[in-house]
Structure formats: structure tokens, C-alpha cells
């Protein structure tokens, strides 16, 4: 099978039009959540099989998963499938919609599920919390199926942000069946630690009366022995752990660690594993980029978010020209940095109703003993355009001006149009743009100012009329990338009394 | 034979503080989780704390927690509570009490010493 | 929490009477249940564990029933010596009392 484009992940704008392509060997497919949506099937003169999906005016709703497959009865020798994973970034979808099943995870072991918790965007930072909880849970995130881990019979949510609001999804619940085969869980107090620091896992088992731990690590194939503690918790019965706790650990002590578990009743086992990275010293990474140019829009609320990874926990400050940066008491800005998962944190500097003066230069700086890293950025405040002034004036010359006057951030781009059948215009007839090109009897002269202090251009533009025979309307547009303004004034001969 | 001895009872002002102490013998100390069980004068039997055999883990009744601090020391076969912020509610005859390994439930118990919180 | 309520607070019987304590959980405790026997100046004693398990040491005419929710202790045919107040305590998540039950002879 060969799909066109491969992918395997796609990002697609919202509103657009996209062409999936699949072709193969016999006649092929597309399938979307076990169905077949309506697509071109075509045989080819050499044999070979396409199948054309077309994916139109597409919404955050199109996200998921996209199957080719081949089409036929005959059983062909491989049960071959191509699968491509469609995002489309919808601030106006939060989580996906699950159906009333998936909000309910029936378990009778304790194993890895997932959370099926999906977003429309893979940039977006997704947390997993407690029902009744803030606190983020450690658990890694896939933005193609969710949160996968084990899970205690509880409760649970996911959160993200998009734009400036926070959004939750329907809760999840996960319910634990009791049955009488062993089950493990392996935990770690870290699973990134310092050459030097402690490694402390612990190995679970829960309903079961007599059972035995055994241990193998990486230190126990050189001979170096730990003896590890059994201990008997006491919130429910025979919820029994095995304490592993290698004390001032090297960068030998890398690697997996597995506990086994046996209980001699029915001689069931069962084991897990857990990885333990021992580092030499500690770390700050940035993930992600964030470009060195951020734009905000004047009077609204901007959230400007890094991504990193960090062992061990660092310190993180925000500063602006220099400046260092707090919670503000007025609350204008918002400073938070959120543990998103054992080693991955998510900083966010929040501008209340952005005022001019809050442009400038941005550097956040993320540091611990061993290391540090720091982002610097430009905050520009874009202000939507107004146009300020339109008058009209009859020269000595005997040619009429009409001077256009605006200002905006960024710089505003200045559209003059005139309209010479008043009854008719614009309604019926589209006005004539005006400019410089010699068939017009018109003129323009522009200059642009930039106001430090106010950080916003001044445009002042004068259009020159050569005769004017008959009433005229007149309309100067200003347009700037956060908006747009339009004035008009009517320009009458000079024969003409007002 | 199990053996449970407390200690450390007491009058003592509200607000003030006490440490009550049980001496285990007769078992290996260090693979049984330990308990405090008080019961009021006229009242019924209260569970106050436990701790796990490794002392890893404690676990306290909410009307206690932040006041009282279960602790052992597993070399001395003892058990300990100490008990600060005291209250006149907390006025009891305190037990020692021994967990089954795996089940939990108090399998062997102490005779208790009396704690009178009063002014 | 799980809540437990012991009944009756008290009786009175005479000597070869059966006599019957209920305890009823506030949620299921899957059998985790066990029952006490205190008399005064003494160390609590465990009778019975896991709903009807006897610990060696407990006369026969001690036995327990029940499931979910809703657990009895009986005591077949009552003698002197089993004067005492009986409690019965949950285990399935941390420990609840019940408020106890006082036995006496008429």
C-alpha cells in the first residue's frame, strides 16, 4: 500500500480542503473510525487500485486517525494497513468527544490503560489531574491517544489551555475489578537521579497473602548485592511492597530494573520493569522554539508559554529589560511554572489586558546548581488601526487633496477608493481604488512616522485630485494585521456650492 | 510468647505534650506493623495510628493528624507516640496493638496506659 | 471513611441464651472484618477475623456471618465468662470500630 502523503502525522489548517490518496496491488479503502467515508475508487490501466479521500472545510472534528486497507474477499496473504494521523488545530475544539464507553475503564488486573483524553493540536500542553485535584500527574502524554500508565480506582481529568483559557475534559472514570491473578506495579521516587543521589523503587502487589519479591538490577550483574525491605502496607489489606534502595548511586546503576513476583498458592507471577537513568550532573533543555518575535494585541490577554526539561527541579524567573518579573498585585501579570511530568515543566508568563508599555524584551531563565538556560524574545504590541482624520481641501491650484490620517501597529497599509455614482455606490457598483497609476487623474503622496513612545506608526496620506466634475465619495481604508478603519468624505467640483 | 508493654502515660495540661512508648518481645518486631488504639472513659475503641514494619509508611486518624507522630525504632523493638497539642478529648487508656502481616487486623494487644489531659 | 454502627449497644441474657451483634458497614468492606472481645483491666482479645474465621483459642460457640455491608456475631449459648463488651472493627480500608456491644447476664 502507498499512501500519498505518507505522513504518519499531518497537521492541516481548519477550513481547508485535503486530498488523502491510497493505492495498491488490489482495491483499497480509507477507513475513519471503522467507517467508510464517501471517496473516488479507480483501477488503473497498468492494475493498479487508488482510492481518493477528500477531506473538505475540515474542523477540529476531522482529527484522528485515518486507515488505508486493502478491499477485497479473496484474503489476501498479508493483513496489511496503513495508518496517518490527522491534526487540525480548532481553537474552538477543546478535547475530543468520547463516546459514553471510553469514559469508563473496566479493569481486572492491574495494567497499563490509557486515558483517551485527545486534542485538536499537537503544540498544546495536556495535564492529567485528580478529579477533586490541581496537582498535575506524573503520567507521559501521547497526543495521538492520551495518557497511558497504571491508575488507581479513581476519577480523573485532563486540562489544557488554548489562547488564554484553561479547558477541562469530561472525567474519566477507571474502576478495578478484583480478581485473584498477581499483579505488580513498579514505581520510582525519581527515574532521572545525580550520580551520588539515592534510588529508591518500589515493587506493589495487592490481594495477594503470600507471595515473594525478587529483584534484578543492573549493580546485581557486577555482584553488588542490595537487600531490599518487604514492608506490609496498612491502608487495605495485603497491599504488600518490596523497598529497593540503592544508596549514592554511580552511572553504572543505569538501566532496567525488574521486579518479579511470585506467590506459591496457585504459582502465579507476574513482573514489571521500570527504567532508571543516572546522570552526571543535572540538566536544563528547552523544547520547542519560541520564536525571538511574540506579538500581543493591545487591551487582550496573551500567554506566553516554554517548554522544558529539568533535573533537578530549577528555579525559574521572568525578566523585562532586565528587569525580574513577579505575580503583579494588581494583576497584570501572571507568572507560573507547572511540573507536567517527572522532569518536563511548562513556564507561563501571563499579560492581563496588554498595555503598550508592556512591550519590550522577554528573557526567561531556568536554572539549578549544575546548569541554566535562558530565552530571550521581543514583545510586540500590535494595536488595531484607526483612522483619525479625513478632510478634504481646494488648493490654490485648482486641484482638490483629501488627507487620510491613521495610526496602528504594525505598520498600517493605506487603501484610497472613490466612487462617482453616489445613488448606485458601494451597494451596487464596487468602488475604483485609487493611486499613482498614470490612467487615474489622482496623485498620492504617503510619509510614515514611528511614535517611540506611543510604539505605533503614524501614516498621513494625501491623495491629489487633478478635476473633479461631478460629486465624488471618497474612502480611505486603513488595514494592519489586528484590523481595519474606513472613512469617507464626498468631494464636490469647485463649480458645485456645498 | 507476644508481649506488649505501654508506657508513658499520664496527667498532662491541655496544649502540652507526651510520648508514649511499647516494648515489644516474643516476635521478630521488624516484620509486623504496629498501631495505637485508645478508648475514652464510658466510650468505645478508636483507632489512632499505624505504622509499617520498615516504619516507611504512617497513617493517622484525621482528628490527630499534625498533632500526633507514630515513629519505631526497630532495633530497640519499641513503638512510640508522641503526642503534642493535646486535647481533654484526647483523654483515653492507650492501647499497643500488633498487625497481622498482609491482612492488617490487630492480632495482639497491649493492657493500655491512661493519658488525662487536664487543666 | 467507612462508617460502622454496632447493634445493639447493650443486652442482657441469661446463661445458655443465644445472643446476636449486628455491625453494618457504611459501604462494602468485602469481609474484612474482625470482632473483639474487652473486659476491664485487660488487653482487647481477637475472637474471630474475616467475618467467621475462629483464631485458635476461641471457643466454638463464638461464629460470624455476613457479606458486603451487613455482618452478625453470635454466640451460640452464652456463659458467665463471656461478660464483656465485644467490638467490631473493619480492616478493608485503614480501621473502624463499632461502638461496642456490653453483654451481661440476667
Known amino acids: 500500500l502507498v499512501v500519498t502523503p505518507p505522513g504518519p502525522e499531518l497537521v492541516l489548517n481548519v477550513s481547508s480542503t485535503f486530498v488523502l490518496t491510497c493505492s495498491g496491488s488490489a482495491p483499497v479503502v480509507w477507513e475513519r473510525m471503522s467507517q467508510e467515508p464517501p471517496q473516488e475508487m479507480a483501477k488503473a490501466q497498468d492494475g493498479t487500485f487508488s482510492s481518493v479521500l477528500t477531506l473538505t472545510n475540515l474542523t477540529g472534528l476531522d482529527t484522528g486517525e485515518y486507515f488505508c486497507t486493502h478491499n477485497d474477499s479473496r484474503g489476501l496473504e498479508t493483513d496489511e494497513r496503513k495508518r496517518l494521523y490527522i491534526f487540525v488545530p480548532d481553537p474552538t475544539v477543546g478535547f475530543l468527544p468520547n463516546d459514553a464507553e471510553e469514559l469508563f475503564i473496566f479493569l481486572t488486573e492491574i495494567t497499563e490503560i490509557t486515558i483517551p483524553c485527545r486534542v485538536t493540536d499537537p503544540q498544546l500542553v495536556v495535564t492529567l489531574h485528580e478529579k477533586k485535584g490541581d496537582v498535575a500527574l506524573p503520567v507521559p502524554y501521547d497526543h495521538q491517544r492520551g495518557f497511558s500508565g497504571i491508575f488507581e480506582d479513581r476519577s480523573y481529568i485532563c486540562k489544557t489551555t488554548i489562547g488564554d483559557r484553561e479547558v477541562d475534559s469530561d472525567a474519566y472514570y477507571v474502576y478495578r475489578l478484583q480478581v485473584s491473578s498477581i499483579n505488580v506495579s513498579v514505581n520510582a521516587v525519581q527515574t532521572v537521579v545525580r550520580q551520588g543521589e539515592n534510588i529508591t523503587l518500589m515493587c506493589i502487589v495487592i490481594g495477594n497473602e503470600v507471595v515473594n519479591f525478587e529483584w534484578t538490577y543492573p549493580r546485581k550483574e557486577s555482584g553488588r548485592l542490595v537487600e531490599p525491605v518487604t514492608d506490609f502496607l496498612l491502608d487495605m489489606p495485603y497491599h504488600i511492597r518490596s523497598i529497593l534502595h540503592i544508596p549514592s548511586a554511580e552511572l553504572e546503576d543505569s538501566g532496567t530494573y525488574t521486579c518479579n513476583v511470585t506467590e506459591s498458592v496457585n504459582d502465579h507471577q507476574d513482573e514489571k520493569a521500570i527504567n532508571i537513568t543516572v546522570v552526571e550532573s543535572g540538566y536544563v533543555r528547552l523544547l520547542g522554539e519560541v520564536g525571538t518575535l511574540q506579538f500581543a494585541e493591545l487591551h487582550r490577554s496573551r500567554t506566553l508559554q516554554v517548554v522544558f526539561e529539568a533535573y533537578p527541579p530549577p528555579t525559574v524567573l521572568w525578566f523585562k529589560d532586565n528587569r525580574t518579573l513577579g505575580d503583579s498585585s494588581a494583576g497584570e501579570i501572571a507568572l507560573s511554572t507547572r511540573n507536567v511530568s517527572e522532569t518536563r515543566y511548562v513556564s507561563e508568563l501571563t499579560l492581563v489586558r496588554v498595555k503598550v508599555a508592556e512591550a519590550g524584551h522577554y528573557t526567561m531563565r531556568a536554572f539549578h546548581e549544575d546548569a541554566e538556560v535562558q530565552l530571550s524574545f521581543q514583545l510586540q504590541i500590535n494595536v488595531p488601526v484607526r483612522v483619525l482624520e479625513l478632510s478634504e481641501s481646494h488648493p490654490d491650484s485648482g486641484e482638490q487633496t483629501v488627507r487620510c490620517r491613521g495610526r496602528g501597529m504594525p505598520q498600517p497599509n493605506i487603501i484610497w477608493s472613490a466612487c462617482r455614482d453616489l445613488k448606485r455606490c458601494p451597494r451596487e457598483l464596487p468602488p475604483t481604488l485609487l493611486g499613482n497609476s498614470s490612467e487615474e487623474e489622482s496623485q498620492l503622496e504617503t510619509n510614515v512616522t514611528y511614535w517611540e513612545e506611543e510604539q505605533e506608526f503614524e501614516v498621513v496620506s494625501t491623495l491629489r485630485l487633478q478635476h473633479v466634475d461631478r460629486p465624488l465619495s471618497v474612502r480611505c481604508t486603513l488595514r494592519n494585521a489586528v484590523g481595519q478603519d474606513t472613512q469617507e468624505v464626498i468631494v464636490v467640483p469647485h463649480s458645485l456650492p456645498f | 510468647e507476644v508481649q506488649l508493654v505501654e508506657s508513658g502515660g499520664g496527667l498532662v495540661q491541655p496544649g502540652g505534650s507526651l510520648r508514649l512508648s511499647c516494648a515489644a518481645s516474643g516476635f521478630t518486631f521488624s516484620n509486623y506493623g504496629m498501631a495505637w488504639v485508645r478508648q475514652a472513659p464510658g466510650k468505645g475503641l478508636e483507632w489512632v495510628a499505624s505504622?509499617?514494619?520498615?516504619?516507611?509508611?504512617?497513617y493517622y486518624r484525621d482528628s490527630v493528624k499534625g498533632r500526633f507522630t507514630i515513629s519505631r525504632d526497630n532495633a530497640k523493638n519499641t513503638q512510640y507516640l508522641q503526642m503534642n497539642s493535646l486535647r481533654a478529648e484526647d483523654t483515653a487508656v492507650y492501647f499497643c496493638?500488633?498487625?497481622?502481616?498482609?491482612?492488617?487486623?490487630?492480632?495482639?494487644w497491649g493492657q493500655g496506659t491512661m493519658v488525662t489531659v487536664s487543666s | 471513611d467507612i462508617q460502622m454502627t454496632q447493634s445493639p449497644s447493650s443486652l442482657s441474657a441469661s446463661v445458655g441464651d443465644r445472643v446476636t451483634i449486628t455491625c453494618q458497614a457504611s459501604?462494602?468492606?468485602?469481609?474484612?472484618i474482625a470482632w473483639y472481645q474487652l473486659k476491664p483491666g485487660k488487653a482487647p482479645r481477637l475472637l474471630m477475623r474475616y467475618t467467621s474465621t475462629l483464631e485458635s483459642g476461641t471457643p466454638s460457640r463464638f461464629s460470624g456471618s455476613g457479606s458486603g455491608r451487613d455482618y452478625t456475631f453470635t454466640i451460640s449459648s452464652l456463659q458467665p465468662e463471656d461478660i464483656a463488651t465485644y467490638y467490631c472493627v473493619q480492616y478493608a480500608n485503614l480501621y473502624t470500630f463499632g461502638g461496642g456491644t456490653k453483654v451481661e447476664i440476667k
Open positions: 459501604q462494602s468492606i468485602k469481609n474484612y
Open positions: 496493638a500488633r498487625h497481622t502481616p498482609g491482612a492488617n487486623y490487630f492480632d495482639y
Open positions: 505504622i509499617t514494619n520498615s516504619g516507611g509508611n504512617t
